[in-house]
Amino acid sequence: SEVEYRAEVGQNAYLPCFYTPAAPGNLVPVCWGKGACPVFECGNVVLRTDERDVNYWTSRYWLNGDFRKGDVSLTIENVTLADSGIYCCRIQIPGIMNDEKFNLKLVIKPAKVTPAPTRQRDFTAAFPRMLTTRGHGPAETQTLGSLPDINLTQISTLANELRDSRLANDLRDSGATIRIG
């Protein structure tokens, strides 16, 4: 099931997604889409990166972190109730079945009438969770290993919900990692 994140109307929402490039600049394409991850690609794409840059984005959707270091977390600016729903972060590892797919559920709450306590960030982060990949045997390792320019070793993401946003900063860089190949 999807990991849940919350934001209030008028705030910026933050949906975390990370991977670790093998080397600086050795990037993997990523897409963000509205709706659960399909088998291929992303549906209703709102932002996309390629091996070098952000090559497609729509208004209010942007990457605030350093995507060249694998921080492809999505920021949605000035959210409304209509922004509620499932979002897909897809790390597009070369190969037919190698992509890592993450479904994140964004819940938008009406803005509070009384002033809220000052927060350092406008988002709810998450406790790290170890990710598992399906073991497909030697063929997958060979497929990845035979690629001359991609030597991806790790992917990471923040996963389970953290309701206490005061811990957000502490957990910001603590995503679990998995090794490919």
């Epitope: 088998v39 073991g135 690629l147």
Partner: antibody, heavy 119, light 112 residues
Framework: QVQLQQPGAELVRPGTSVKLSCKAS????????MHWVNQRPGQGLEWIGV????????DYNQKFKGKATLTVDTSSSTAYMQLSSLTSEDSAVYYC????????????WGQGTTLTVSS | DFVMTQTPLSLPVSLGDQASISCRSS???????????LHWYLQKPGQSPKLLIY???NRFSGVPDRFSGGGSGTDFTLKISRVEAEDLGVYFC?????????FGGGTKLEIK
Amino acid sequence: QVQLQQPGAELVRPGTSVKLSCKASGYTFTSYWMHWVNQRPGQGLEWIGVIDPSDSSTDYNQKFKGKATLTVDTSSSTAYMQLSSLTSEDSAVYYCARNDYDGGYFDYWGQGTTLTVSS
Amino acid sequence: DFVMTQTPLSLPVSLGDQASISCRSSQSLLHSNGNTYLHWYLQKPGQSPKLLIYKVSNRFSGVPDRFSGGGSGTDFTLKISRVEAEDLGVYFCSQTTHVPWTFGGGTKLEIK
């Protein structure tokens, strides 16, 4: 050994729906995508769509969106395809096929279910 | 969609002859990851298709070495060096580089 078992035939009335099954055995069901392909009488093969049993994500050939719905029951290692609002045009052989993780090719196929839509 | 065009539609051969089937795609099948996802299947009457060749030129397990595949980009060929009776049927090419995955229209290999 890998097997994909499908019923041999289904006869249904126009306007109704049918749910075709494909029971997998001999491998870890959630580790391979399952596809559905149809073949009208005397015609070629047409890719309908795919489901990833590990998370039930799907993708469809645009032509079959709204017509076909793919689901899985991982407890019984069975894939299903529901076809709705059936017409005689939907009469065909429907195959399930597993795709190999390395190259996207169909390494194992079911024997196919012959669907006949007739009043 | 990515159209796959097979020629000929029908291929009459004598047993022991060489047979060659062509498959042309409307766009390049070279994937951004460097692989070309072009495959060949044989469907015998009353049976489901069976995989022969995957990723242009790799024989699937149990497929005799008289079958070979080649080509690149948009043009691909399946060759049978010495046709045997068990080779008769309809041959389909298929691409899985682009979504939706598509098949060629088929080539029927039959006795002359």
